[in-house]
């Protein structure tokens, strides 16, 4: 059979060849002629065999972290008859290791973020570093991990590398440290080989500072002309911590609250106090108000170190305006009857200097041929009024200071012009009508209406009545509808288109105003041949052919 | 070619040790066995042994006790150590190579050094 | 170990005969491991066969050998003028490696 020993041979060895051991055979009495052969992998390349003696020999130098066994196979041969002597077998050369790899922190860079004021053993992070040689070879791959920097506020665990705070820090002094570990093979013994890591440690913030006002009083100024929601001025309060626990709210103490606001920009953490209601120097010319500033998020376990918020005086002075002439009323409306005579008085307006010289007022109607206003805001008529020309005037007056002609104010002016019955009433069109020779006593001829141009305080009523001659004359008549209409009747039974053409009728027209007044108006009736049917009709073509000039016979 | 050559002290003292170096020339000292010969004046040829280029040796039995072969591949030298010597040590030194007609199992010397001559006296 | 035995001892022949020196081995060589060496004086011994029959690189086709198990025979067909030279027999097919003692061949 076959006789050796396990094969070992010590990665890295620098010497050209290294003996291993010896394979031989138990038939192999040194008197015969046995040839030894190797196979397999690395066979005849890392590992040589003395094929006259068995001697196996390492040729390379090997690297057990490579590769650290190696399978080959042997064989034994008597060259004398040229047969195997023993069957072929498998037989491993292990590689020991030796202590030729350092630890390596593989999972570099390593960061960390902890909370600020942490307690002492709170866990940071856990580095590990990884050694390539042989676990199972002695101590090769024992780690032990140090600090190398980063005492007194770091430690870390000699075999599990975690790292654990091990005194408070504040991040308002530093936000951030560099621990760097080291890691030591062989348990830190004599030869050991080492590898280091640094690990970035960030402090993340906690809200253990309020803020606090950078001054004590702040002065500012409002201009008494400034609108509702005018800022007129920043405060501004400082916190040591970052982000959300750096965000602030700004008030006011509940006292000063009437006039004055204060809104927190977020983005800049200012406080920006806002006019709330407007000021008038003359009224109140200066303001004192108190604001306090508290952080937006305090988590309860953080409340002891915000027991009282920061607070500071704020003195706002009021600037005087030279304000513009302030009327009594926003506009005014006054009415005026037409047809008054020039000078007629309309209504008097007002205007006074609100600012503490009271400077005299003059007054102007912008863009009015028709209206006078004198110093005293008298309005007269400068012209006559006809409401049937414009019942309304929409104007401005315009109140100016004496003293500084730009500071002028202007305020709307109604004026309506009220009617009186100055019109009398009038056909509402011209009216031209036909009546057939032939018509008959009591026919409707037309039918007429009237307008005016006056307004009615009730409905208007028209009275209709044909004129003294005409009532004489007894060709036609007239009935008033009682609706503001009338019809014109033929008053006789035939009609000579030779003898008398065309009728001029005069009407009457009165109104119900008082006084009421009657116009006159004229009615042409013209006679047509309207054949046998009797209809008039049939005057409608002769109304074309006579409106056209042809004589018809 | 292939060149072989012996050096080493011709004067050896009773007792002492025997040292010679063989070097290569021409090739490598790899893959090959390499031996060491030596003739006595006026006899014939005795064989003391070989290194293979690995460091595996083998000695003639007859002198073993006494016999170190060690190889330096890095130089392409090997060399002899013969402790103990004694007037019968007395003999022309070769160093020889053996062929490799037939791998791995013992061949004939196709290649010799000229030879050198070492006295042991006193 | 293997002991060679040669004969003749001196073998005295003139230019263009024919030479036969014998070699005896004290038991049979494994796989024919058989070499023949010629040496002349202040010379290194040089390979002419091995493997029994096998001639070496160069050596010219007058020199044959021949033999197996434990007697073999080289033989120079045409002796030369330069052939006359001591020469020995060598087995390798066991350790340790044994020449014989030499046959000198001599002009006569």
């Known amino acids: 059979g076959w006789v050796w020993n396990q094969f070992f041979v010590p990665e890295e060895m620098n010497t050209t060849s290294h003996h291993i051991g010896q394979l031989r055979s138990d038939l192999d009495n040194g008197n015969n002629s046995f040839q030894y052969k190797l196979l397999g992998a690395g066979a005849g390349s890392t590992f040589i065999i003395d094929e006259r003696t068995g001697d196996i020999y390492a040729i390379q130098k090997l690297d057990r972290e490579e590769r650290s066994l190696y399978i080959l196979r042997a064989q034994v041969i008597d060259i004398a008859t040229g047969r195997a002597v023993e069957p072929e077998s498998e037989f491993v050369i292990k590689v020991s290791d030796i202590n030729d790899n350092e630890p390596k922190f593989l999972d570099e860079p390593y960061e960390a973020i902890v909370p600020e004021m942490s307690p002492e053993g709170t866990l940071v992070i856990q580095v590990t570093a990884s050694d390539a040689d042989d676990p199972s070879s002695g101590n090769n791959a024992r780690l032990l991990y140090s600090l190398l920097q980063g005492q007194p506020y770091f430690s870390v665990e000699p075999t599990t590398g975690v790292i654990r705070i091990s005194s408070k820090m504040d991040r308002e002094l530093q936000d951030e440290y560099w621990v760097i570990i080291q890691a030591k093979d062989m348990i830190g013994q004599p030869g050991a080989l080492s590898g280091t890591t640094s690990v970035l440690i960030k402090l993340s913030d906690v809200n253990d500072n309020k803020p606090i006002f950078k001054e004590s009083l702040y002065r500012l100024t409002v201009s008494e002309s400034a609108p509702t929601g005018t800022s007129i001025g920043t405060i501004m309060a400082y916190d040591n911590d970052i982000g959300e626990n750096a965000e602030m709210d700004y008030s006011i103490e509940e006292d000063d609250s009437q006039t004055f606001d204060i809104i927190t920009n977020h983005e800049t953490q200012e406080g920006i106090v806002i006019l709330k209601k407007k000021v008038d120097f003359e009224h109140q010319n200066h303001y004192g108000i108190r604001a306090k500033v508290k952080n937006h998020h305090v988590p309860e376990q953080l409340m002891k170190y915000h027991t009282e918020a920061s607070t500071t005086f704020i003195k706002i002075q009021v600037e005087d305006v030279d304000e513009p002439p302030l009327f009594l009323l926003p506009y005014y409306v006054f009415e005026v009857f037409e047809e008054t005579p020039q000078g007629s008085f309309v209504g008097v307006v007002s205007a006074t200097d609100p600012d503490n010289r009271k400077s005299p007022i003059r007054y102007s109607i912008t863009r009015s041929k028709v209206f006078n206003i004198n110093d005293n805001g008298t309005i007269t008529t400068s012209n006559s009024l006809d409401r049937e020309i414009s019942a309304w005037y929409n104007l401005s007056i315009t109140a100016t200071e004496k003293y500084n002609i730009e500071q002028i104010s202007s305020i709307p002016l109604y004026v309506q012009v009220l009617n009186i019955n100055d019109h009398a009433p009038e056909f509402s069109q011209y009216y031209e009508t036909y009546v057939c020779e032939n018509a008959g006593s009591g026919q409707v001829i037309q039918t007429i209406s009237a307008v005016d141009r006056d307004e009615s305080i009730e409905e208007h009523h028209f009275y209709f009545n044909l004129s003294v001659e005409d009532t004489n004359n007894s060709s036609f008549t007239i009935i008033d509808n009682q609706d503001n209409t009338a019809v014109i009747l033929t008053n006789r039974t035939g009609f000579n288109l030779q003898e008398e053409p065309v009728f001029y009728i005069s009407i009457l027209i009165a109104d119900n105003g008082i006084p009421s007044l009657t116009s006159t108006n004229t009615l042409t009736i013209h006679v047509c041949d309207c054949g046998d049917s009797g209809s008039t009709q049939t005057c409608q073509y002769q109304e074309l052919v006579l409106s056209m000039g042809f004589k018809t016979e | 070619q292939v060149q072989l050559q012996e050096s080493g002290p011709g004067l050896v003292k009773p007792s002492e040790t025997l040292s010679l170096t063989c070097t290569v020339s021409?090739?490598?000292?790899?893959?090959?066995?390499w031996s060491w010969i030596r003739q006595p004046p006026g006899k014939g040829l005795e064989w003391i042994g070989y290194?293979?280029?690995?460091?595996?040796?083998n000695y003639n039995p007859s002198l073993k006790s006494r016999v170190t072969i060690s190889v330096d591949t890095s130089k392409n030298q090997f060399s002899l150590k013969l402790s103990s010597v004694t007037a019968a040590d007395t003999a022309l030194y070769y160093c020889?190579?053996?062929?490799?007609?037939?791998?791995?199992?013992?061949?004939?010397?196709?290649?010799w050094g000229q030879g050198t001559m070492v006295t042991v006296s006193s | 170990d293997i002991v060679l035995t040669q004969s003749p001892g001196t073998l005295s022949l003139s230019p263009g005969e024919r030479a036969t020196l014998s070699c005896r081995a004290s038991?049979?060589?494994?796989?024919?491991?058989l070499a023949w060496y010629q040496q002349k004086p202040g010379q290194a011994p040089r390979l002419l066969i091995y493997?029994?029959?096998s001639r070496a690189t160069g050596i010219p086709d007058r020199f044959s050998g021949s033999g197996s198990g434990t007697d073999f025979t080289l033989t120079i067909s045409r002796l030369e003028p330069e052939d006359f030279a001591v020469y020995y027999c060598?087995?390798?097919?066991?350790?340790?490696?044994?020449f014989g003692q030499g046959t000198r061949l001599e002009m006569k």
């Open positions: 020889a190579r053996e062929s490799r007609y037939r791998s791995g199992w013992y061949d004939a010397f196709d290649i």
């Open positions: 021409g090739g490598s000292i790899s893959s090959y066995y």
């Open positions: 290194i293979y280029y690995i460091g595996s040796t």
């Open positions: 038991q049979s060589v494994a796989g024919s491991y």
């Open positions: 493997g029994a029959s």
């Open positions: 060598q087995q390798y097919g066991k350790s340790p490696i044994t």
